[in-house]
Each structure stands twice: as C-alpha cells, then as structure tokens.
C-alpha cells in the first residue's frame, strides 16, 4: 500500500560514531518528502526531521537517553505538498530500518595521543578521553565514562629507526612501558572493546614520535 | 522493572555437574553483562564469572576455568551457569547480578533469588 | 590472583559514622577498580549499595557513600541505624576479573 507518485525509502542505514548517531536512507527525494520515527521496542514513537527533503537524520538526542536500549526507526514518504495525503491502508508508505543498539554497535571514533613522557627509560602515554554526546546530570560523558571497564586501548610503538612494532594493553587510558635509553619511539593507539561481535576495534590514531612537540623527555 | 529469576534448588552427586539458569526482564537484555557469583554457607562472595548476552562473550575465574560455562538464549533472555565435576566444596548458593548502569557505572546491582546447589553422595 | 582486604569486623554506635575500607595487594585502588560495595544481612541475600567506586543505586539511601581515600576504596556510614547491621563486601575489577574481599561484619551497639 502507499500514496500515488511516493516511493519507500530503501537501504535504511545507521551511521554512528561515539554515539553520534545518523540514520541514512535512499533515494534523493523526487516530489516527495520525508519524516522519521524512532522508538524502543517497548516504548511510543517519536518524530523527527518533519517533512524534510533529507536523506539523513540526526537522532542522537534520542539514542543517547539509553544507549544500552535497542532502537528501531522508520522512515514515512509523503508528496511533495499534500503531506496530509495517504495510501490505500489509510496509512503513509513507510520503511523499517535495522535493529540499533548502540551500546553494543557505535563506532569508536579514531583516538589522540594526548600526551607522552619520558623518564629515564619509562614512557607514559596518555589517550585524550574523548567527550561523548552521552549527558549525566547535565555534564557529557567521555568515552571511558560510558564503557567503562569493557573498553581497552593498544598502543603500537616502534623506535623511529626501525620498523618492528610492539604492543601494550590498558585498561585505563595510560600505558607505562619501557624503551632503550637514547633511542627515539613513535606511537600509535586504537580503542578496543573486546567483547563485541562488531566495529571491535577504532581506526589508528594518529602517529606521534618522540622529539616532536606533543611529548616531554626528562632525562634522570 | 528489572527482574533476575533463578531456577530451583539442586542436589547433585560428587563428579555431576548442575546447569543453574538465569531468566531477565525489564530491560534491555544484550546490553549488560550477567555476573554470576557464589556463596558457600558461612562464606563470602565469591566471583565465578560474567557473560555478556549480546555476543556472548565470556570472562571466568581463573579457579573455575575449564570446569565452568557460561551461555544465553536470547529467545528467551535467559542465562545459563553450568559447573561440571562437582564437589562437596561447591555446595553454595549461586547468585546471578546485573549491573546499575546510568551513563556509567560498572559492578553488581541487580541480583537474583538465589540458587542452593547442593553436592553429597 | 589479586586479594581484596577488608576489616573483618568494626562497630559503631546508633546515630555514629563508621569507614570500611578496602585495600589491594597490588596496589592503589583506583577508579579504573570500578569499586562495588555490597551489602548482606543475615538470612537474605546481597544487595548493592554502591557500584562504579561512588554511584548509589536508587534503592540506597544517602547515609552511605562510597569514594577513593589514598590507595584505598572507602564506604562511609553516617548516622548508622540498627538495620545497617550486616556483612559488607567489597569487590574491585582487576582487568578481566572481579575479586571480592572477605567481607567486614558491621554491629551496630
């Protein structure tokens, strides 16, 4: 069922990272608009991005009230104009998009080094906690906030002579390790949560070596 | 609301194992980690291992390891803990829990009933 | 494996405030611990007053808090009432484990 001269949206897609969460679909809109719902799957309906000529939806206000609910949103199609306008079941034309949990399923955005350290033969490095769209008592939760203890990161470092990398895991957001005195070391971290099915792993930070600005180097 | 039910008291043999289930409700059930923890009687808590619904991954207590598995139903929501190559000194009641998760926060809130398992010839 | 210490037994007048506390043998008790404080009273079963090192669940009430005090995990009771008499347990998370500690019997006298 559904109205003269729409078309379904198609290829419903959820686009997430850190929680920042966009739902995108098909096609580019031809005389027709569109409007979105999204609702837990115990929850009422809500909508969003009323009659836009759209093919995407910012829904993070929405998915960031429960992270760890599951969501489902739909996309309803309208002509262009008589909006009020519906298909034969008395209903719009509308799409269901996948199942979205976004606890289990957002991206890990790409890490920073914040900062390293030097001190004789030790090197701390530091990961930048990354502020989420997650609120608590009106104040954003970083990423450890919200993960908490299944989130870990890797460090890669290699000396800047050589091309053998190492590793080290924490489960804070610093790593201490050891490096050859007088040789210089670049770094590289991902974000990791081990216990999921999917998007496991963040992209590489950015390299950072020793030398450069970001660290310090205090020789005892 | 949330809700952790544990399934009946057990009597088992020496070198039996016993499947002890954990069936949720009132919230999301792949989100959150499943702890199980024991009690032998007179005793403190003691930590067995977790499992987390979603992808059913799995951490156990290095003691338990290779006697214990920890497995779920999603059809269902519910948990499972079962201990093979029972002893008398596994007699306890076994405690299923659920984490208080608001924005953060990461231990043992919700718990079941409990489960007396008992282990004699 | 790691051992969690608690005191094994404290007491605290009606109305007094008392600190349990929980060490590491290796180490300082940080927030990456993730601190959880459990409550048991004789013939029942546990209950959580406190996870994550300091967030109350909605069911404990605001005489106890939970904190970090220099290398230690702290539960402070204020005003303690007779039905705080009970077994508390502390439990911190070692990188892939929880460890309990062996608990610290409360009296209230």
């Known amino acids: 069922s559904g109205t003269t001269n729409t078309v379904a949206a198609y290829n419903l897609t959820w686009k997430s990272t850190n929680f920042k969460t966009i739902l995108e679909w098909e096609p580019k809109p031809v005389n027709q608009v569109y409007t979105v719902q999204i609702s837990t799957k115990s929850g009422d309906w809500k909508s969003k991005c009323f009659y836009t000529t759209d093919t995407e939806c910012d829904l993070t206000d929405e998915i960031v009230k429960d992270v760890k609910q599951t969501y489902l949103a739909r996309v309803f199609s309208y002509p262009a104009g008589n909006v009020e306008s519906t298909g034969s079941a008395g209903e719009p034309l509308y799409e269901n998009s996948p199942e979205f949990t976004p606890y289990l399923e957002t991206n890990l955005g790409q890490p920073t080094i914040q900062s390293f350290e030097q001190v004789g033969t030790k090197v701390n490095v530091t990961v930048e906690d990354e502020r989420t769209l997650v609120r608590r008592n009106n104040t954003f939760l970083s990423l450890r906030d919200v993960f908490g203890k299944d989130l870990i990161y890797t460090l890669y470092y290699w000396k800047s002579s050589s091309s053998g990398k190492k590793t080290a895991k924490t489960n804070t957001n610093e790593f201490l390790i050891d490096v050859d005195k007088g040789e210089n070391y670049c770094f590289s971290v991902q974000a990791v949560i081990p216990s999921r099915t999917v998007n496991r792993k963040s992209t590489d930070s950015p390299v950072e070596c020793m030398g450069q600005e970001k660290g310090e180097f205090r020789e005892i | 609301q949330v809700q952790l039910q544990e399934s009946g008291a057990e009597v088992k043999k020496p070198g039996a194992s016993v499947k002890v289930s954990c069936k949720a409700s009132g919230y999301t059930f792949s989100s959150y980690w499943i702890e199980w923890v024991r009690q032998a009687p007179g005793q403190g808590l003691e930590w067995m291992g977790e499992?987390?619904?979603?992808?059913?991954?799995?951490k156990y207590n290095e003691k338990f390891k290779g006697r214990v598995t920890m497995t779920r139903d999603t059809s269902t929501s519910t948990v499972y803990m079962e201990l093979s190559s029972l002893r008398s000194e596994d007699t306890a009641v076994y405690y299923c829990?659920?984490?208080?998760?608001?924005?953060?926060?990461?231990?043992?809130?919700?718990w079941g009933q409990g489960t007396l398992v008992t282990v004699s010839s | 494996q790691a051992v969690v210490t608690q005191e094994p037994s404290l007491t605290v007048s009606p109305g007094g405030s008392v600190t349990l506390t929980c060490r590491s043998s290796t180490g300082a008790v940080t927030t990456s611990n993730y601190a959880n404080w459990i409550q048991q009273k004789p013939g029942q079963g546990p209950k959580t007053l406190i996870s994550g090192t300091n967030n109350r669940g909605p069911w404990t009430t605001a005489r106890f808090s939970g904190s970090i005090l220099g290398d230690k995990a702290v539960l402070t009771l204020w005003g303690a009432h007779a039905e705080d008499e009970a077994d508390y347990y502390c439990a911190l998370w070692y990188s892939n484990h929880w460890v309990f500690g062996g608990g610290t019997h409360l009296t209230v006298q």
């Open positions: 829990a659920r984490d208080y998760y608001y924005g953060s926060s990461y231990g043992f809130a919700y």
């Open positions: 499992i987390l619904p979603g992808s059913a991954s799995t």
